[in-house]
């Protein structure tokens, strides 16, 4: 149940994609990747306000008690909803592999 | 990928399941469920410290960039690994219908 | 497993259009960091680089047949098309594409020979 | 465009034997050179990545070394199978670009 997609709060601050540049240093990957040396990281960033986005009953009993006891129980959050693959030149004991990795790069976002 | 179990922020602070009584009136159903009138929702809640129970690869990147730059990445989010499924007795039209819910109970947690 | 095929008309006369497929299958070029490259090789001759496309659409070619080229991606089908306009007898080689992970080449189809003939 | 140069065009060798191949190119290109082996018939397989990291499944005899302009291909111990053309090819910019090859034959 995706439910609205209409941002209460403005444009582009609710739960969406993003993508943050990231160098394999920032990553913390320099010493076992090769390549690429910078990654566009997509990224599922922003706010879940009631029912946006909403990717299961789930969600929608977490909207309601965060709205009942807003310290007890937290709004939902910003997730990947599924994800695009990527492959990464990496380093083995013996030389290099090309490794493909299927849960790195968010493809879309649901509030959780 | 299921990293460290142990919080570095003390006993019961970071991300885990948490179970919240909520009646029908909390979760907004008295219209459309009879029974139970009173649930025990487990759900997720805690700090996502540092690679603490990483669900995948992309946890793992954002919790790096989180690190580099706070303002923009958020870290990582306590949310349901699986769910339990659940009966609700609901109205119809016409009476009533036992209809089971998988997506409605967290089962365990991890952080993404 | 990861494997390519190249498909085209085997003879084709000067001043025509030559068209090239790459079937391929074991990998995706929707995947981030995946391309597909083409590489010709002329009877008895070495390598040489025509042109590549990324799994986000963007397209490299040799700076000499640049003018003469088109390259593009068909994601679901898994296949990826070169044309080269304008052939002369230069353009007589195997035509080889391969399976690239940023600037690795590791897994290349059989090649098809494509003669440029009256 | 960078252009890539071999040297020997051809050799005789013989099983067991040490080979060394060079490759100059015309400008700097790091350590951006791969290896590839051609038997006759067949597509180029790749051997090199980035001068000196082999590929999986490519046998330690193979090694790679160099950065700059100067690289150097070789096979410490000649198997039978390998007598093959061998070709570098700079990855450092597009258009990329191969030596003209190595011909490795039996003595």
């Known amino acids: 149940a995706r439910n609205g997609d209409h941002c209460p709060l403005g444009p582009g601050r609710c739960c969406r994609l993003h993508t943050v540049r990231a160098s394999l240093e920032d990553l913390g990957w320099a010493d076992w990747v090769l390549s690429p040396r910078e990654v566009q990281v997509t990224m599922c960033i922003g706010a879940c306000p009631s029912q946006f986005r909403a990717a299961n009953m789930h969600a929608q009993i977490k909207t309601s008690l965060h709205r009942l006891k807003p310290d007890t129980v937290p709004a939902p959050c910003c997730v990947p909803a599924s994800y695009n693959p990527m492959v990464l030149i990496q380093k083995t004991d013996t030389g290099v592999s090309l490794q493909t990795y299927d849960d790195l790069l968010a493809k879309d976002c649901h509030c959780i | 990928a299921r990293n460290g179990d142990h919080c570095p922020l003390g006993p019961g602070r970071c991300c885990r399941l948490h179970t919240v009584r909520a009646s029908l009136e909390d979760l907004g159903w008295a219209d459309w469920v009879l029974s139970p009138r009173e649930v025990q929702v487990t759900m997720c809640i805690g700090a996502c410290p540092s690679q603490f129970r990483a669900a995948n690869m992309h946890a793992q990147i954002k919790t790096s960039l989180h690190r580099l730059k706070p303002d923009t990445v958020p870290a990582p989010c306590c949310v349901p690994a699986s769910y339990n499924p659940m009966v609700l007795i609901q109205k119809t039209d016409t009476g009533v219908s036992l209809q089971t819910y998988d997506d409605l109970l967290a089962k365990d947690c991890h952080c993404i | 497993q990861v494997q390519l095929q190249e498909s085209g008309p085997g003879l084709v006369k000067p001043s025509e259009t030559l068209s090239l497929t790459c079937t391929f299958s074991g990998f995706s070029l929707s995947t981030y960091g995946i391309g597909v490259g083409w590489i010709r090789q002329p009877p008895g001759k070495g390598l040489e680089w025509i042109a590549h496309?990324?799994?986000?659409?963007?397209?490299y070619f040799n700076t000499a047949l640049k003018s003469r080229l088109t390259i593009s991606k068909d994601t679901s089908k898994n296949q990826v098309s070169l044309k080269l306009s304008s052939v002369t007898a230069a353009d007589t080689a195997v035509y080889y594409c391969a399976r690239m992970g940023y600037d690795i080449m590791d897994y290349w189809g059989q090649g098809t020979l494509v003669t440029v003939s009256s | 465009d960078i252009q890539m140069t071999q040297s020997p065009s051809s050799l005789s060798t013989s099983v067991g034997d040490r080979v060394t191949i060079t490759c100059k190119a015309s400008?700097?290109?790091?350590?951006?050179v791969a290896w590839y082996q051609q038997k006759p018939g067949k597509a180029p397989k790749f051997l090199i990545y980035s001068s000196s990291y082999r590929y999986t499944g490519v046998p330690d005899r193979f090694s790679g070394s160099g950065s700059g302009t100067d690289f150097t291909f070789t096979i410490s111990s000649l198997q039978p199978e390998d007598f093959a053309v061998y070709y570098c090819q700079q990855h450092y910019s597009t258009p990329w670009t191969f030596g003209q090859g190595t011909k490795v034959e039996i003595k």
């Open positions: 400008q700097d290109v790091n350590t951006a």
């Open positions: 496309i990324w799994w986000n659409n963007n397209k």
